[in-house]
């Protein structure tokens, strides 16, 4: 466009500015050692210091460590950004009893309402389940489904909240890392090789290009490039592709330049706790109890429901093999998630019924 030419020429004559063809504007050239906070900076305040991956620039202009969510009772709520820390919260089915800066020092399982009580408010990451007396005349066995609400994030029933975080954690600080390697991997959704540059389960700033760095002058290809095993997310950040290296996972789709790898539970297992592009917890395919039959649904996004088999039919389940292994499943990533409103428990042969919820996806 001819009208852009004079502006471009003026721009080139000014050493503190450059012309960005992509936005057809004159942009402020950040001084050496500072990086732009937007594609076309206009003034010095649009330039900032750069921090290493997994560090953010705090108000005092210091690079500060983002909190880590790799303790097995925590999940990432918001990622580590250039100007703000990662935020962690208790994983689904748990609530925070002792808060910490950008995280939680102690998580407890949500309480399950005792007999004669029903859920008034389901538990959240911040609050425990609130129970209230059941309506008069309704038995603990629940006469009607409306009057008998299960906790929306039911877990192994607990008489009172049960802590799982290390006792050494303190409210004033970020929790220390704990738990087994497998638990860390399951909870944080991503794994890393011992010498991998990725952060466990979290988007990281590309150690190369600044996420907000403008295209090189005169460059036609403005797409930011990411390291191997990273993809370019919608926010223009290089984000770690999930890892399927846990032994109960297999790769479903590969890591591409603009999308993460996706993982699914290996054959013979189904997903009990879903995770972004993966599964946080795979369990052996359930052995149906007599008089129940699985009603398959679409993979990990929907709840599996259980219903009585039609008269005259056998349950659609394989008998338990003698070696105790679960039979191979035709839908390996089918989610083992129970409809939280239907007051059902899974027919898994355990001493106590296990209620699993889909609310914490």
């Amino acid at each position: 466009f001819p009208q852009d030419r004079p502006f471009e020429d003026t721009c080139h004559g000014n050493p503190s500015h450059y012309y960005d063809k992509a936005v057809r504007r004159c942009c402020y050239r950040c001084p050496m050692g500072l990086f732009p906070t937007q594609q076309c900076p206009q003034r010095p305040t649009d330039c900032r210091k750069q921090c290493e991956p997994d560090y953010y620039l705090d108000e005092a202009d210091r690079c500060t460590a983002c909190v880590t969510c790799s303790r097995d009772d925590l999940v990432e709520k918001t990622p580590c950004a250039w100007n703000s820390s990662r935020v962690c919260e208790c994983r689904p089915g748990m609530f925070c009893s002792t808060s910490a800066v950008n995280s939680c020092a102690r998580c407890f399982f949500h309480s399950v309402c005792p007999a004669g009580m029903i859920v008034k408010f389901p538990g959240t990451a911040q609050k425990n389940t609130v129970c209230e007396p059941a309506s008069p005349g309704v038995s603990p066995a629940c006469a009607s489904p409306e009057n008998c609400k299960e906790p929306s994030s039911g877990t192994i029933p607990q008489a009172k909240p049960t802590p799982v975080s290390p006792a050494t954690s303190s409210a004033s600080t970020m929790p220390v890392r704990g738990g087994t390697r497998l638990a860390q991997e399951a909870a944080s959704k991503l794994t890393r090789a011992p010498d991998s540059p990725s952060s466990v389960g979290r988007p990281s700033s590309d150690p190369g290009l600044s996420p907000t760095q403008p295209c090189p002058e005169g460059s036609g290809d403005c797409r930011k490039q990411c390291e191997p095993d990273y993809y370019l997310d919608e926010a223009g950040r290089c984000t770690a592709c999930v890892s399927c290296s846990r032994d109960d996972l297999v790769e479903k789709t590969p890591c591409a330049w603009n999308s993460s790898r996706t993982c699914e539970c290996r054959p013979g297992m189904i997903c009990a706790t879903s995770a972004t592009n993966s599964c946080a917890r795979c369990v052996p395919y359930p052995i149906c109890a007599a008089e129940t039959v699985t009603k398959p649904q679409d993979m990990a996004e929907k709840d599996t429901t259980f219903e009585a088999p039609p008269l005259g039919t056998q349950p659609d389940c394989n008998p338990t093999p003698e070696n105790g292994e679960a039979p191979a499943s035709t839908s390996p990533t089918q989610s083992l998630l129970v409809d939280s409103q239907a007051s059902k428990t899974l027919p898994i042969p355990t001493s106590a019924p296990v209620a699993l919820s889909s609310t914490g996806k």
Epitope: G33, F35, Q50, C51, E52, P53, D54, Y55, D58, R62, C63, T64, A65, C66, V67, T68, S70, A100, V101, P166, T168, S172, T173, M174, P175, V176, R177, G178, R192, P194, D195, S196, P197, S198, S199, V200, R202, S204, P207, G208, L209, S210, E227
Partner: antibody, heavy 120, light 107 residues
């Protein structure tokens, strides 16, 4: 395996400059920022600053801003630190250091150190 | 800058003893504390980070703990090869700073 090989000892006169090197191997050089740490004889450790080898971006501890200059050569996977206007206070062992990973894992890999002796 | 204080310059111990080295930060460092071991003529070696996470290959007799401003490194049963200098470091924010060191000696 990850290795950081530093250049040999330097003997310099007050007011002079020295430039030491740190050759990285066993990983992709541009993936990790290179840190530098100073240790005076019989004393503690001081963080000097770091460089992003991919972009040349540097950040320094205020104390070393006018003393150290960090550079990196991608083609040879080598990081450099130049110390200027040397005084006896600069006599120390200087380490190049790399993180173990980017999940907050700090200085897992250290070079063997370069001893700088400043003497008239 | 965050100051890391190791109050004991020296600590005397015997082989098999349990020893605890302390470190205090001048402000809350949110458990972003690492511990290093250094032997004469060698580079420092990472032992612990995020206050309690043992680095790969570090024997389990080394444990770290603490929160807020107070951190400790404990060696449950001191071995001869553990006699060295121990430094704490905050990897919380720039400039990263180290303690002055604690030297573990045999009684």
């Amino acid at each position: 395996q990850v290795q950081l090989q530093q250049s040999g000892a330097e003997l310099a006169k007050p007011g002079a400059s020295v430039k030491m090197s740190c050759k990285a191997s066993g990983y992709t050089f541009t993936t990790y920022w290179m840190h530098w740490v100073k240790q005076r004889p019989g004393q503690g450790l001081e963080w000097i600053g770091y460089i992003n080898p991919s972009t040349g971006y540097t950040d320094y501890n205020e104390k070393f801003k006018d003393k150290a200059t960090l550079t990196a050569d991608k083609s040879s996977s080598t990081a450099y630190m130049q110390l200027s206007s040397l005084t006896s206070e600069d006599s120390a062992v200087y380490y190049c250091v790399r993180r173990g990973s980017y999940d907050g894992n700090p200085f897992a890999y250290w070079g063997q150190g370069t001893l700088v002796s400043v003497s008239a | 800058d965050i100051v890391m204080t190791q109050s004991h310059k020296f600590m005397s111990t015997s082989v098999g003893d349990r020893v605890t080295i302390t470190c205090k930060a001048s402000q809350d460092v949110s458990t972003a504390v690492a511990w290093y071991q250094q032997k004469p003529g060698h580079s420092p070696k990472l032992l612990i980070y995020w206050a309690s996470t043992r680095h790969t290959g570090v024997p389990d007799r080394f444990t770290g703990s603490g929160s807020g401003t107070d951190y400790t490194l404990t060696i449950s049963s001191v071995q001869v090869e553990d006699l060295a200098l121990y430094y704490c470091q905050q990897h919380y924010s720039t400039p990263f700073t180290f303690g002055s060191g604690t030297k573990l000696e045999i009684k």
